[in-house]
């Protein structure tokens, strides 16, 4: 399995972001396909579970991403993307996309470095 991501993503605080992850595999996509998204915070704290897909999508039942993430992928199109809602500044960090599609061997985990930035205010535009 090979993974492709946007590598770097910038999004405005309070908005939603699509974390894009696509993949290729020599094996046909079927019920064995699994997708796991995790998050590594900027402060070096423990990695956190974000999302899981296996036949159906499953949100986390606890933690910071509870009720803030949804599936936006399409396995038949080799798309394992998710939507992250209501971005906060502490969502800054690295999101990892891991796709397993047996019998294909696991590939390198895809990474997206998300930067959540301030909303650009009119005064800032004026001074720019």
């Amino acid at each position: 399995v090979e993974i492709y991501t946007s590598r770097v993503l910038e999004a405005v605080n309070g908005t939603d972001a699509r974390l894009k992850c696509t993949f290729s595999s020599f094996a046909p996509v079927g019920d064995a396909l699994t997708v796991t998204w995790n998050f590594r915070p900027l402060d070096g704290g423990p990695e956190q579970f974000v999302f899981y897909y296996h036949i159906d999508p499953f949100q986390p039942m606890s933690g910071r991403f509870k009720d803030r993430v949804s599936w936006d992928g399409n396995p038949e199109r080799y798309d394992a993307s998710i939507l992250l809602w209501k971005l906060q500044f502490d969502d800054n960090g690295t999101y990892t996309c891991q796709v397993k599609n047996p019998p294909d061997v696991d590939g390198v985990i895809g990474e997206i470095r998300l930067s959540v930035v301030h909303t650009v205010r009119f005064s800032e535009i004026h001074f720019l």
């Epitope: 704290g45 579970f49 499953f58």
Partner: antibody, heavy 116, light 106 residues
């Protein structure tokens, strides 16, 4: 490194209350929800509830609803679990644990003995 | 609440053996966690969301399954693997644990 240090063992009489503390260090306290799990002697694991340290929001196992209160003190990075109306079947080791990719980090456990 | 039933409850095996523990749910769950616990110690995570190894866990441990049936496999038992193993679901609240499987030295 992540550490969760719990308060010491307690012996209580039936009907009393107990408050167990869990001091967290080695990570940003508000970034991870704190859970409480108990284990009766020689028995399996039972989830009590969870608390979001950022806003104090809680979710309890219905079995304990009305008897358990989870709180946090952000200034000291400490979580608390208070269980009231204790009965003998509440005798157990009580653990605090944080949810990361699983319940990855656990306190050392606090033995609460309920005996008349 | 979703009930998890582990089988077997007790298992005797030897170093080097391949061991499989099964966890059956009373209704379909989306994914499963597995923990190892040694006497007097807190549980230690092995597998998260069905098949992902927790940090620092050796590759001899693996997880699989879907729906109502999940398995934990240890490909070649090591002396330090003798312990009690618990499955846990978190597809619906409250999260629940299996009753445990005690793995003993034959």
């Amino acid at each position: 490194q992540v550490q969760l240090v719990q308060s010491g063992a307690e012996v209580k009489k039936p009907g009393a209350s107990v408050k167990v503390s869990c001091k967290a260090s080695g990570y940003t306290f508000t970034n991870y929800w704190m859970h409480w799990v108990r284990q009766a002697p020689g028995q399996g694991l039972e989830w009590i509830g969870e608390i979001n340290p950022t806003n104090g929001g809680t979710d309890y196992n219905e079995k304990f609803q009305g008897r358990v209160t989870l709180t946090v003190d952000k200034s000291s990075s400490t979580a608390y679990m208070e269980l009231s109306s204790l009965r003998s079947e509440d005798t157990a080791v009580y653990y605090c644990t944080i949810y990361t990719t699983a319940l990855d980090y656990w306190g050392q456990g606090t033995l609460v003995t309920v005996s008349s | 609440d979703i009930q998890l039933t582990q089988s077997p409850s007790f298992l005797s095996a030897s170093v080097g053996d391949r061991v499989t523990i099964t966890c059956r749910a009373s209704s379909s769950v989306g994914y499963m966690y597995w923990y190892q616990q040694k006497p007097g110690k807190a549980p230690k995570p092995l597998i998260y969301v069905t098949s992902n190894l927790a940090s620092g866990v050796p590759s001899r441990f693996s997880g699989s399954g879907s729906g109502t049936e999940y398995t934990l496999t240890i490909s070649s038992l090591q002396p330090e693997d003798f312990a009690t193993y618990y499955c846990q679901q978190w597809s619906s609240n409250p999260p629940t644990f299996g009753q445990g499987t005690k793995l003993e030295i034959k």
